[in-house]
């Protein structure tokens, strides 16, 4: 028999404690949130906030500008400044709770816990390849607004999610906070509204729509909004929250919350709970049918997939998915699967159910007893009646109310159980060639490049690399600029090319020269590298 | 100061397609909005349609199969073509900007054009 | 589409004293709290020029003495003393719904 080379076991052949430096930015405190620009003529900018400041980053991660945001009623706050002479409210911190571009201005608006949380508008001055910020406007208007009604009263403190959408020559505010009595009460941002920036920027419109957690379950019933999106005609916030506002607080579930992107109201707001499960190929003895659950969200992300995992999925290459990573509980601690799992929910297949779920309860026959839910927004009915309301009248149509679709969206992890003790913090998919990367950030301050597929017992990694000595948590914000992905860990930002930052983790020839096209990879004498690495003889072809 | 200046031929024959060009200084067309408005004599204003920021594109409906808005963000210019074009298209064509609402706070001059053959 | 209705068509005014020009919209044009009017000046041999917009806010550069009020369907353009500049056709033009539409105009011009 002919001697063969002893193969090399497929985790011998990479070492992912291989040392990768990648371009950072220290923000000077905890990174509260983060957001790229990217304009028509080759300018771009990082805008990075921090507890009471807001820096201006160029694309290589180097400060512009920086901006006192905070704190409220300190002299040297210039955002506060931008409101005219004070005091606008109680002296405080301003932590930033909303940061988003206005792209038609284009300006950024940042949002902050202090000032009743109003907002300011920041027009973008291009400067070279560069972007400063010009004098902020302050979004609030004294005269029209009240703790009961505060049209200008954007960010709660507990959290706050927006998504801008454009729709003719406007801009619209889809807002979506976590509320408590507390915040409730003191200047009144609704769970989830729209609204309309005006047009001479000195706030927002007073007539805006809005869902509110009613006041008798502010206490016990909280809503965490994890992310939100825009894709299509619709905008989606993610949401952890109750699964019943009559059970166990604690016993918690994801909703998907769906909303217009064309009509800026909220009559067709829909809710559909998601279900991901761990299910094992092998079933121990005594695990639940239809595998484990892991009902709490921890990120999200949406993404056109490549054609592999297309198929797999059986959708049409760049159809949009919404992935999620989900945890068995708030801590997201340890059970009898992994720590977390992936799932995949096919933006179409979601439009479908909840449509079907609007039919079930709007068409004759309508199943008795079928509830159109929400009872924390509305008043508790049954399909087809409005809220509140025994029957419908001529005039009203059980289209136009928000409605919590009957049935579930259920898929099982995508990775198999593989990511085990993996505690996933921050994601963000991308589609390059026809391979689906999702690039995630750990609660150790690893970065895990890893192709999405769904048939194999192993992670096809691209990379699997630590950000830098703190190992502090990877945020759940991820940005891109360019062909690079922004992640920020404790108070650094970090920029990781989106093909991997290296080859060097790949310790043997055939490994790297089997490496995806987009990596660039090739054997270099004796090492894995990209042509730039490599001064002599490079190889992509075959191995010495 | 924000200046835009239409140009392009002030006759053109019947079924024909009528071209101008908007050129833009002291702003970029990659923000805000950028609109074709005409005034035919003895008629209303009429909104043509715009080109945005991003290069998205609304037409009248009433013009809907006749009518393209393009741009050069290179040379900060955009463009309206008008094919098919009859005597009733005969009217003072008008370029403008506006950042919110089709509030068109700034103008070209407004340039003649005749459809006649 | 919205139909605008403007009266008078013609306005003979004299300067210092106060002017007043109405427009109609076939529906209403508010939204969100807002109306969506506009109103434009155009002066002989110029371009239009944005006077008030979102129906009472005065545009860049725009005198003190012309003011805008109204809402749902009938909105008002008012000039506290005329001046001789002033002369010219002023159009309201609606952006609640596209296409936006304009008045057809009012001539304003001096006794």
């Known amino acids: 028999e002919d001697w063969q080379c002893p193969r090399t076991p497929y985790a011998a052949s990479r070492d992912f404690d291989v040392k990768y430096v990648v371009p950072s930015f220290s923000a000077g405190g905890l990174v509260q949130a983060m957001v790229t620009y990217e304009g028509d003529r080759n300018e771009s900018a990082v805008f990075v906030a921090i507890r009471n400041r807001l820096h201006v980053l160029g694309p290589d991660l180097k400060s512009v500008q920086s901006l006192a945001t905070g704190p409220a009623g300190d002299p040297g706050c210039q955002t506060c400044a931008a409101c005219g002479p004070g005091p606008h409210g109680p002296p405080g911190d301003t932590d930033t709770k909303v940061l988003v571009l206005d792209p038609a201005l284009p300006a950024l608006v940042s949002c902050g816990s202090s000032l009743q949380g109003r907002c300011f508008l920041h027009d973008l001055e291009p400067q070279g390849t560069a972007v400063h910020l010009a004098a902020p406007a302050c979004l609030f208007s004294a005269h029209h607004n009240r703790p009961d009604d505060c049209p200008d009263c954007v960010a709660s403190p507990l959290g706050t999610r927006v998504t801008v959408v454009e729709q003719g020559q406007a801009s619209y505010f889809y807002v979506a906070s976590s509320l408590d009595a507390a915040v409730a009460a003191s200047f009144s941002p609704r769970s989830v509204s729209i609204r309309r920036l005006k047009a001479d920027a000195s706030g927002f419109a007073p007539g805006f729509v809005a869902l509110s957690v009613l006041p008798k379950h502010l206490v016990s019933y909280s809503i965490e909004y994890v992310h939100s999106f825009h894709t299509g005609a619709f905008v989606y916030f993610l949401t952890v929250q109750p699964a019943s506002v009559t059970d166990d607080p604690s016993a918690l579930h994801t909703r998907l919350a769906r909303l217009s992107a064309t009509e800026p109201e909220l009559g067709d707001y829909r809710e559909l709970v998601l279900d991901c499960r761990f299910a094992p190929k092998r079933r121990r003895r005594g695990a639940p049918e239809g595998g484990q659950p892991y009902p709490v969200l921890r990120v999200a992300h949406s993404a056109p997939v490549g054609a592999q995992l297309a198929t797999e999925l059986s959708i049409a290459e760049g159809q949009e998915v919404l992935f999620g990573v989900f945890v068995t509980g708030k801590d997201g601690g340890p059970g009898v699967g992994p720590n977390s799992v992936v799932c995949a929910f096919p933006i179409d297949l979601l439009d479908t159910l909840i449509d079907e779920g609007v039919e079930r309860c709007c068409e004759s026959p309508v199943h008795p007893g079928l509830r159109r839910g929400l009872d924390f927004f509305q008043s508790p009915s049954f399909c087809p009646n409005p809220p509140g309301l025994e029957a419908l009248s001529p005039n009203t149509s059980c289209r136009h109310f928000p409605l919590l679709v009957s049935s579930s969206f259920s898929r099982v992890d995508l990775f198999n159980g593989l990511l085990g003790p993996v505690q996933v913090t921050a994601l963000y998919v991308t589609r390059l060639d026809n391979v689906t990367v999702a690039h995630m950030g750990t609660m150790d301050g690893r970065i895990l490049q890893v192709e999405l597929v769904r048939s194999l017992n192993y992670l096809l990694y691209v990379s699997n690399f630590s950000l830098g000595d703190s190992g502090q948590p990877v945020q759940r914000d991820v940005s891109r600029l360019g062909d690079h992905l922004l992640f920020a860990s404790g108070d650094q930002v970090f920029q990781v090319p989106i093909q991997g930052p290296g080859c060097r983790h790949f310790l043997t020839c055939g490994r790297c020269l089997r490496a995806w096209h987009f990596m660039g990879c090739g054997w270099c004498g004796n090492m894995c590298g990209q042509q730039k690495e490599c001064p002599g003889s490079w190889q992509q072809d075959h191995c010495p | 100061q924000v200046q835009l200046q239409e140009s392009g031929p002030g006759l053109v024959k019947p079924s024909e397609t009528l071209s101008l060009t908007c050129t833009v200084s002291?702003?970029?067309?990659?923000?805000?909005?950028w609109n074709w408005i005409r005034k035919p004599p003895g008629k209303k204003l009429e909104y043509m349609g715009y080109?945005?920021?991003?290069?998205?594109?609304y037409y009248n409906p009433s013009l809907k199969s006749r009518i393209t808005i393009s741009r050069d963000t290179s040379k900060n210019q955009y463009s309206l073509k008008l094919s098919s074009v009859t005597a009733a298209d005969t009217a003072v064509y008008y370029c403008a900007r506006s950042k919110y609402d089709y509030a068109m706070d700034y103008w070209g001059q407004g340039t003649l054009v005749t459809v006649s053959s | 589409d919205i139909v605008m209705t403007q009266s008078p068509l013609s306005l003979p005014v004299t300067p210092g004293e106060p002017a007043s020009i109405s427009c109609r919209a076939s529906?209403?044009?508010?939204?969100?709290?807002?109306?969506?009017m506009n109103w434009y000046l155009q002066k002989p041999g110029q371009s239009p020029q944005l006077l008030i917009y979102a129906a009472s806010n005065q545009g860049s550069g725009v005198p003190d003495r012309f003011s805008g009020s109204g809402s749902g369907t009938d909105f008002t353009l008012k000039i506290s003393r005329v001046e001789a500049e002033d002369v010219g056709v002023y159009y309201c033009q609606q952006s609640k719904e596209v296409p936006p539409t304009f008045g057809g105009g009012t001539k304003v011009e001096i006794k």
């Open positions: 529906e209403i044009v508010d939204n969100f709290g807002i109306s969506f």
């Open positions: 080109i945005s920021y991003s290069g998205k594109t």
């Open positions: 002291g702003d970029s067309i990659t923000s805000g909005y």
